[in-house]
Every structure is written in structure tokens, then in C-alpha cells.
Amino acid sequence: SLGSLTIAEPAMIAECKTRTEVFEISRRLIDRTNANFLVWPPCVEVQRCSGCCNNRNVQCRPTQVQLRPVQVRKIEIVRKKPIFKKATVTLEDHLACKCETVAAARPVT
């Protein structure tokens, strides 16, 4: 009620910046034709832009990105035994972010 003491602190905006996120390495990234394998590791960390902006008309967007190839292990199971292979997955890291104006939606033609 009005005038009652409050212990809660003011909410701080989650600013638009790069943050560490978890990216799942789906098997489709490695091989779309075969499902009989495992991938190690199943997920990795990437840097991605997130957060909100002071204005509803703008969005947190990456202004600089970097592609980073990483090696994963593809474990094919043949007759219950593993065959180890290496595969390269290209990750996208966001290096810089900016609150950018949301482009007006294009009319569907």
C-alpha cells in the first residue's frame, strides 16, 4: 500500500550486449543423410547479442559477427561399435551489438 516500506530494488534493464549462450550442435549440422551417430560435445558456448533497448521501435542486433570453426567428434555406431570421425562445425559469434531500428514489415505480394 501507499507509503509502505519496500525492500525490492529497482529493476535494471538487461542492456543490449554480447552474452554467452549455449548452442546445441544438432546432428543435422554434421550429416543430414544419416541418423545413426552421436556428436560430442552436444553443445557449445557462443557469444550472442541479447538484451532490450530503451525504445520499442528498436531491437538488439549484432553489428559485427565472426565465424569460428570448431572440431567435434562424430561417433558412428556400426554393429554396436563406434567408429570415430572428426567433423568441423562453423559457429557464429556476435562481437558487437547495437539497438537498431526495426525495418518496417514488407507487404506480402
Epitope: R73, R79, K81, P82
Partner: antibody
Framework: EVQLVQSGAEVKKPGSSVKVSCKAS????????MYWVKQAPGQGLELIGR????????DYVEKFKNKATLTADKSTSTAYMELSSLRSEDTAVYFC??????????????WGQGTTVTVSS | ETVLTQSPATLSLSPGERATLSCRAS??????MHWYQQKPGQQPRLLIY???NLESGVPARFSGSGSGTDFTLTISSLEPEDFAVYFC?????????FGGGTKVEIK
């Protein structure tokens, strides 16, 4: 219970050959690779190679390609390692080790008791 | 090949103390690192697989951690039966390799 039982100690002359056996029980022999590992006196462990008992296909570490020959007999669930042209540096304890499956991981989860091979003139 | 360097070579401790064993790889091995215990005249025994997973039947005082190139095996409180040699082994790069071992001895 998975068990790997190896043949007994051997004393051999330089230049001769030796064949070590490893009898497996407690699991389906053809469903796991078998590895062989060398441990020289007072030393660490060194991988020699592996065999797929299902079809006899082998992979060797480069330095053992002309030294070790791995075979397997499905009918007796026994893996073998033959060492040729023996020299004093082949004196060691040799282990067979099963290739275990642990989710994404494949450690050596069961080991034979070891076979001591001594090369001496 | 991937060289695994274990340190220290020898660790002198008393029962009840904490043991921290290190294994450093010459190149990244992800988390495909395993730890084995070997007592004199015996075969190695699997303790930890995949850097941090405790093998079935192994006491909870054993734990593993690390990824990339630096790995640690910790024994929280040494029991008399824990005095032995410990080896790390990587299975990311061919050929699979072992470390030189750390001997944990009674002080």
C-alpha cells in the same frame, strides 16, 4: 562380470617371437574392441593397437606396426597379440583391455591381469 | 601425438588428507579424458571417464574435473587403499595416449 584372463609369463630369446592370449568372458566378445597396452618396467602405459573381434580388422600405433600382430578367435572369445623379432626393449608387462561404452565416452573399462614378457639371452 | 604430462610425479600424503593430481595435455582433448588407478603387480582400474564421470563401484571420494588441456583428479580424503599410481588417458586424438603417472605414497 566382465573378465579378461591372460596367458602366463614368458621368457624369450632375442630375435624370437611370443604370442600372448587374452580370454574374455561376461560379455559378448564381438561387441567390443580389444586394446593392447604395453608397460615397460617402472614406466607408464603405452597403447599398441586394437582389434575388432567381429571381423578381425586392426589399428596399430605407428611404432608397433612392425612389432605386434593382433588376432582374435570368435569361437573361443580369445584375443591374441604376437610380438616378433624380440629385443630387450620389448621386455614389459602387456595388458589386454576392453573398450567400454559409457554414453559418449569409450574408456578401457576392463583389463586383463597382465602378461610379463622378458627378453633375455 | 598428444602428450599428457602428469604432476607431481610423486605425492606424499597421510591418510585423511586431500590429494590433487594434475594432467595437462599438449593440445585440447575436449573432455575425453579418463583416469585409472594401478596398484603394484595389478592391472589398471578405471576410476573416472569423460573427465568427470565416476565409474560404477568407485567410491565417491574420487572426483574429476577439467576440459580442454587441464584436468584434475581429486581424492577428497585418502584411505589406506588409495595409495597407488594414477594415470590419465585421452581418447580425443589418435593415437590415444597415457600420462606418465602420479604415485601417491604414504607420508
Amino acid at each position: 562380470e566382465v573378465q579378461l584372463v591372460q596367458s602366463g609369463a614368458e621368457v624369450k630369446k632375442p630375435g624370437s617371437s611370443v604370442k600372448v592370449s587374452c580370454k574374455a568372458s561376461g560379455y559378448t566378445f564381438t561387441e567390443s574392441y580389444m586394446y593392447w597396452v604395453k608397460q615397460a618396467p617402472g614406466q607408464g602405459l603405452e597403447l599398441i593397437g586394437r582389434i575388432d573381434p567381429e571381423d578381425g580388422s586392426t589399428d596399430y600405433v605407428e611404432k608397433f606396426k612392425n612389432k605386434a600382430t593382433l588376432t582374435a578367435d570368435k569361437s573361443t572369445s580369445t584375443a591374441y597379440m604376437e610380438l616378433s623379432s624380440l629385443r630387450s626393449e620389448d621386455t614389459a608387462v602387456y595388458f589386454c583391455a576392453r573398450f567400454g561404452a559409457r554414453s559418449y565416452f569409450y574408456p578401457m573399462d576392463a583389463w586383463g591381469q597382465g602378461t610379463t614378457v622378458t627378453v633375455s639371452s | 601425438e598428444t602428450v599428457l604430462t602428469q604432476s607431481p610425479a610423486t605425492l606424499s600424503l597421510s591418510p585423511g588428507e586431500r590429494a590433487t593430481l594434475s594432467c595437462r595435455a599438449s593440445e585440447s582433448v575436449s573432455t575425453l579424458m579418463h583416469w585409472y588407478q594401478q596398484k603394484p603387480g595389478q592391472q589398471p582400474r578405471l576410476l573416472i571417464y569423460g573427465a568427470s564421470n565416476l565409474e560404477s563401484g568407485v567410491p565417491a571420494r574420487f572426483s574429476g574435473s577439467g576440459s580442454g588441456t587441464d584436468f584434475t583428479l581429486t581424492i577428497s580424503s585418502l584411505e589406506p587403499e588409495d595409495f597407488a599410481v594414477y594415470f590419465c588417458q585421452q581418447s580425443w586424438n589418435d593415437p590415444w595416449t597415457f600420462g606418465g603417472g602420479t604415485k601417491v605414497e604414504i607420508k
